[in-house]
């Protein structure tokens, strides 16, 4: 995907594998008043020490407050898989737009591929 991926840690010159959000559904088309759910997921190896939470953005603005998002963590011996779920109940035309996930890993911002929600009247 077309995302900035960190190459080195700030504390050591040890090379790290690139990290990027996994591919997801791109263009969602649905009728007004339907419910919609989509997600971003990312696998963070143990070699990455500093990670921040996933934030959701729409058309360049961070979505804060009354938006229904849940983040789930699935750790294993190699690292952690993170899935950020976003849902909109009874979509309206104003929900049209480009949704992105953002996350900071080792002080580098990673941005997901877009999820474009198109609400038809």
């Amino acid at each position: 995907a077309h995302t900035a991926a960190p190459q080195v840690t700030s504390t050591a010159s040890k090379l790290l594998p690139p990290v990027a959000f996994n591919h997801t559904i791109g263009h969602i088309v649905l009728s007004e008043h339907k419910n919609v759910k989509f997600n971003c997921s990312i696998n963070i190896p143990n070699t990455y020490q500093e990670t921040a939470g996933i934030s959701w953005w729409k058309d360049g603005k961070e979505l804060l407050g009354a938006h229904h998002s849940i983040t789930q963590f699935y750790p294993d011996e190699e690292g952690v898989s993170i899935i950020a779920l976003f849902s909109i109940a009874s979509v309206q035309r104003s929900d049209n737009g480009s949704y992105f996930c953002k996350m900071k890993v080792n002080n580098r911002e990673i941005v997901s591929d877009p999820i474009y929600v198109e609400v038809q009247g």
Partner: antibody, heavy 122, light 111 residues
Framework: QSLEESGGRLVTPGTPLTLTCTVS????????LGWVRQAPGKGLEYIGI??????TYYATWAKGRFTISKTSSTTVDLKITGPTTEDTATYFC??????????????????WGPGTLVTISL | DIVMTQTPASVEAAVGGTVTIKCQAS??????LAWYQQKPGQPPKVLIY???HLASGVPSRFKGSGSGTQFTLTISDLECADAATYYC?????????????FGGGTEVVVR
């Protein structure tokens, strides 16, 4: 909603040429507008786009050869800076499907103009 | 740049038959893919977007499918009016750029 291209004509190689896309019933502060060309008997070739915010993006091959600019609330220009005979084509402008004040979006094309023919010849 | 490879370049089928056109992207574009129909002397007309959604007024004989890098346009119950050239288009984008490209086109001849 409609679009119409103008300015297509016969010019000699190296003579700059400006094409204009005039829109009717389309808010250029909400929609992106793209340019696509088609050489005689050939396929569609994407040139570039100007977003609702005024951000321009060009196909790699088109960078430096074309300039897209919003010249009024109803017109967008495509300047061919140094045309060669390979630039002979019908040039189409088209409205992006995505309404939103953002620089980048899913720009497939819902509405097209009829095209204007540009001929570059000695 | 993303490169869209369309096959075949030309296909012929009888009225009432079915044609299948394939489009391959050089990298994953999710479902950010549109299909257009163009008849001689006319601008293209969008048929399908989001890989599989029919544009307004397009008959259900046109069907799009696929995701990632492999996409298909199927036209069933062919009519004479379907004789045209068909193009796929990637409209993938990111938070910093766009990746628009057309396929080379497929001429559909209806006999």
């Amino acid at each position: 909603q409609s679009l119409e291209e103008s300015g297509g004509r016969l010019v000699t190689p190296g003579t700059p040429l400006t094409l204009t896309c005039t829109v009717s019933g389309i808010d250029l502060s909400s929609y992106a507008l793209g340019w696509v060309r088609q050489a005689p008997g050939k396929g569609l070739e994407y040139i570039g786009i100007i977003s609702s915010t005024g951000t321009t993006y060009y196909a790699t091959w088109a960078k430096g050869r074309f300039t897209i600019s919003k010249t009024s609330s109803t017109t967008v220009d495509l300047k061919i800076t140094g045309p060669t005979t390979e630039d002979t084509a019908t040039y189409f402008c088209a409205r992006g499907a995505y309404a939103g004040y953002v620089a980048f979006g899913p720009y497939y094309f819902h509405i097209w103009g009829p095209g204007t023919l540009v001929t570059i010849s000695l | 740049d993303i490169v869209m490879t369309q096959t075949p370049a030309s296909v012929e089928a009888a009225v009432g038959g079915t044609v299948t056109i394939k489009c391959q992207a050089s990298q994953s574009i999710s479902n950010f893919l549109a299909w257009y129909q163009q008849k001689p002397g006319q601008p293209p007309k969008v048929l399908i977007y989001a890989a599989s959604h029919l544009a307004s007024g397009v008959p259900s004989r046109f069907k799009g499918s696929g995701s990632g890098t492999q996409f298909t346009l199927t036209i069933s119950d062919l009519e004479c009016a379907d004789a045209a050239t068909y193009y796929c288009q990637s409209y993938f984008y990111s938070s910093t750029s766009i990746y628009n490209a057309f396929g080379g086109g497929t001429e559909v001849v209806v006999r």
